[in-house]
């Protein structure tokens, strides 16, 4: 008789990444009988929620339910109805909500309360909404990329199943750039982690990992731009800010109240003789780079070596996956190729920033002007952060791999978060069974 396929025995999980600029919903799927195997969980859907990050709903919390509806309904469609009740839903909020909590814990709680109320109305197994720490964000990003790259599996392979794979078990470092914070996480080479706050110990699949991580709050690309503007307007002679990080001919009016709304600009706050100022782009990479460097305090270091602002950073080791905004920005600028040297990236950024705004708008007619206008700053910021902030060099640049997806799953903290909360990364190496359950009878 003919073999008949049994119904798929799969499980699903949902993670919402409530970032500072937007929220994304990810749906993951895995074979139920292979939960403890490495590399079996994969992303089946990403849904980007229309609108800003949840921290922007502080004055309109009643709109949060509608905001989340489309993506939650999409999850209802993608996941079979029979699986709804056993599908866990997690929401993790990152630096945008960390900043809101610094301003007002009560307001942050109110936002999360409404988010939780909205999400608990769906037929899934809602597990709560929380603000994850910067340390968690770094750690889970590191777990995600190494899980997807197959670094935790003990089987050595003579063939490569994923790009960037070097057939050894050396883990990749993780570089994550968001709108409000940036994380650096890696296993240093036999180096003591001098600052306990930056040390993580994991036992995964029978192997111990001593991991360094740090999250720089206020050094995501959006908050870094606010910081730079607040710093530069201090020395402007009038309400015109000639800014090298924007294209020549670009103009934008900024409200001083918006500039000082974020805790990230508090250190630059001063009484200005105007309520608004106008940014006028002059498009000069070198000057933009110099201005950005002033955000990094490198004059003080209580350790053997530091990144910036007195934060310990061990010597860089191995390959790094750079994802989230590191990838999105470099992808837009067409600079993600492994063959592009750091010198070439710098050269191309110089040319890009110098292009007139009218020309840029014509070349990228389909891109929203708000985003388009900031790529010169963002690209320059990425170079400044990686080179001067984290001490990558022209030589070690080739160890940075700008990664969007690995085997169809987005690089980012959400997969690692779900793997941890569903206990799918065992501390010990699972015993391999001679035969897996057959899916045919």
């Amino acid at each position: 008789t003919q073999n008949k396929a049994l119904p798929e025995n799969v499980k699903y999980g949902i993670v919402l990444d409530a970032g500072s600029s937007h929220t994304s919903l990810y749906i993951y799927k895995w074979p139920a009988e292979k939960e403890n195997d490495t590399g079996v969980v994969h992303q089946v859907e990403e849904c980007r929620v229309k609108g800003p990050g949840i921290s922007k709903f502080v004055q309109k919390v009643n709109e949060i339910g509608i905001y989340l509806t489309d993506c939650m309904e999409r999850a209802r469609e993608v996941i079979p109805r029979s699986q709804h009740q056993e599908t866990p839903v997690y929401l993790g909020a990152t630096a945008g909500m960390r900043l809101l909590r610094m301003e007002s814990e009560e307001l942050a709680d109110r936002v999360l309360d409404v988010v939780e109320r909205s999400l608990s109305n769906y037929p899934f197994d809602f597990q709560g909404a929380r603000i994850i720490t910067g340390q968690e964000e770094g750690a889970y990003g590191w777990i995600t990329i190494n899980y997807l790259l197959g670094k935790f599996s003990q089987k050595t392979r003579w063939f490569s199943i994923v790009p960037y794979e070097t057939n050894n078990q050396e883990t990749f470092g993780a570089l994550d750039l968001g709108g409000a914070s940036t994380q650096v996480t890696f296993v240093p080479q036999n180096q003591t982690i001098e600052s306990p706050d930056n040390a993580l110990q994991f036992r995964l699949y029978g192997k111990d990992y001593n991991v360094y991580t740090h999250s720089f709050l206020c050094y995501g690309k959006d908050q870094a731009l606010w910081q730079k503007l607040a710093k530069d307007i201090q020395v402007a002679s009038n309400e015109i800010l000639r800014d090298p990080c924007f294209h020549p001919g670009y103009k934008k009016v900024v409200n001083v109240s918006d500039l000082y709304k974020t805790p990230c600009t508090k250190r630059f706050e001063m009484t200005l003789p105007f309520q608004q100022f106008e940014i006028q782009g002059i498009g000069n990479y070198q000057q933009c780079h110099q201005s950005i460097l002033e955000l990094f305090n490198t004059s003080y270091c209580p350790y053997s070596q530091c990144a910036f602002n007195g934060i310990f950073l061990p010597p860089l080791q191995g390959d790094f996956g750079a994802f989230s905004a590191f990838y999105f920005v470099m992808k837009f600028l067409n600079l993600t190729s492994e063959k592009v040297s750091q010198e070439k990236v710098t050269e191309m950024m110089k040319k890009f920033c110098a292009q007139p705004w009218e020309e840029i708008k014509t070349s990228y007619a389909g891109v929203k002007e708000k985003y388009l206008s900031e790529y010169c700053f963002s690209g320059t910021y990425i170079l400044s952060l990686l080179l001067q902030g984290y001490h990558f060099t022209a030589d070690s640049w080739e160890h940075i791999h700008f990664i969007g997806k690995i085997q169809g799953s987005d690089a980012g903290w959400t997969l690692g978060y779900m793997l941890n909360l569903t206990n799918m990364i065992p501390a010990e190496q699972p015993l391999s069974t001679p035969l897996s359950h057959s899916t045919y009878v």
Epitope: R101, E105, E106, D109, L112, D113, E116, R117, S120, F126, G128, A129, R130, I131, T133
Partner: antibody
């Protein structure tokens, strides 16, 4: 809206135990810690301890260790505070109060209406 | 444990006057961990101020908090009839402790 509703007044004999309940509504129960604070007649506020309803972990003030037990029932969104070996000095109004979310600070935003426990022979 | 001492024990003032309540800690307290509550007879306490100076939601702006380290102050800029009550400060450092309270009564 967020509400904490406590069980009614109790009269107990010295040496007995009392169990006070606090039912939460209007929010996701597991997301916030719950504290217990008591107030003897005409006196100030005295913190007794807290419970994390998500995992059931507890932290008791040193003074009450060994005599107090805080538990929760997630199916009914209720926390309980049991005080044993009662003495007359335990006569007080007992309040439950909602504490922080994970990563927050310990301020008590929402309070129950209070439960008067009288210990008398 | 950290001991909080409130003074004065009783403050007799008239409506419209300014009230200044003091809370002193036996050792330094992070301002993130200091709060003020108001309690009226027969009612549960009500949160007024947290983070030493952040007003809780719905609290009128005549209430303000200040201070750092070991010395904290609650100020009521113009007393309204409904403000006559007992005020407690509270700190958190491993364990929560409350001050003994200050009673604000009508003169």
């Amino acid at each position: 809206q967020v509400q904490l509703v406590q069980s009614g007044a109790e009269v107990k004999k010295p040496g007995a135990s009392v169990k006070v309940s606090c039912k939460a509504s209007g929010y996701i129960f597991k997301s916030y810690e719950m504290h217990w604070v008591r107030q003897a007649p005409g006196q100030g506020l005295e913190w007794m301890g807290r419970i994390n309803p998500s995992v059931g972990s507890t932290w008791y003030a040193q003074k009450f260790q060994g005599r107090v037990t805080m538990t929760r029932d997630t199916s009914t969104s209720t926390v309980y505070m049991e005080l044993s070996s009662l003495r007359s000095e335990d006569t007080a109004v007992y309040y439950c109060a909602r504490g922080k979310r994970e990563g927050g600070t310990e301020y008590l935003r929402v309070w129950g209406q209070g439960t008067l426990v009288t210990v008398s022979s | 444990e950290i001991v909080l001492t409130q003074s004065p024990g009783t403050l007799s003032l008239s409506p419209g006057e300014r009230a200044t309540l003091s809370c002193r800690a036996s050792q330094s307290v992070s301002s993130s961990y200091l709060a003020w509550y108001q309690q009226k007879p027969g009612q549960a306490p009500r949160l007024l101020i947290y983070y030493a100076s952040s007003r809780a939601y719905g609290i009128p702006d005549r209430f303000s908090g200040s201070g750092s380290g070991t010395d904290f102050t609650l100020t009521i800029s113009r007393l309204e009839p409904e403000d006559f009550a007992v005020y407690y400060c509270q700190q958190y450092h491993n364990a929560i402790t409350f001050g003994g309270g200050t009673k604000v009564e009508i003169k």
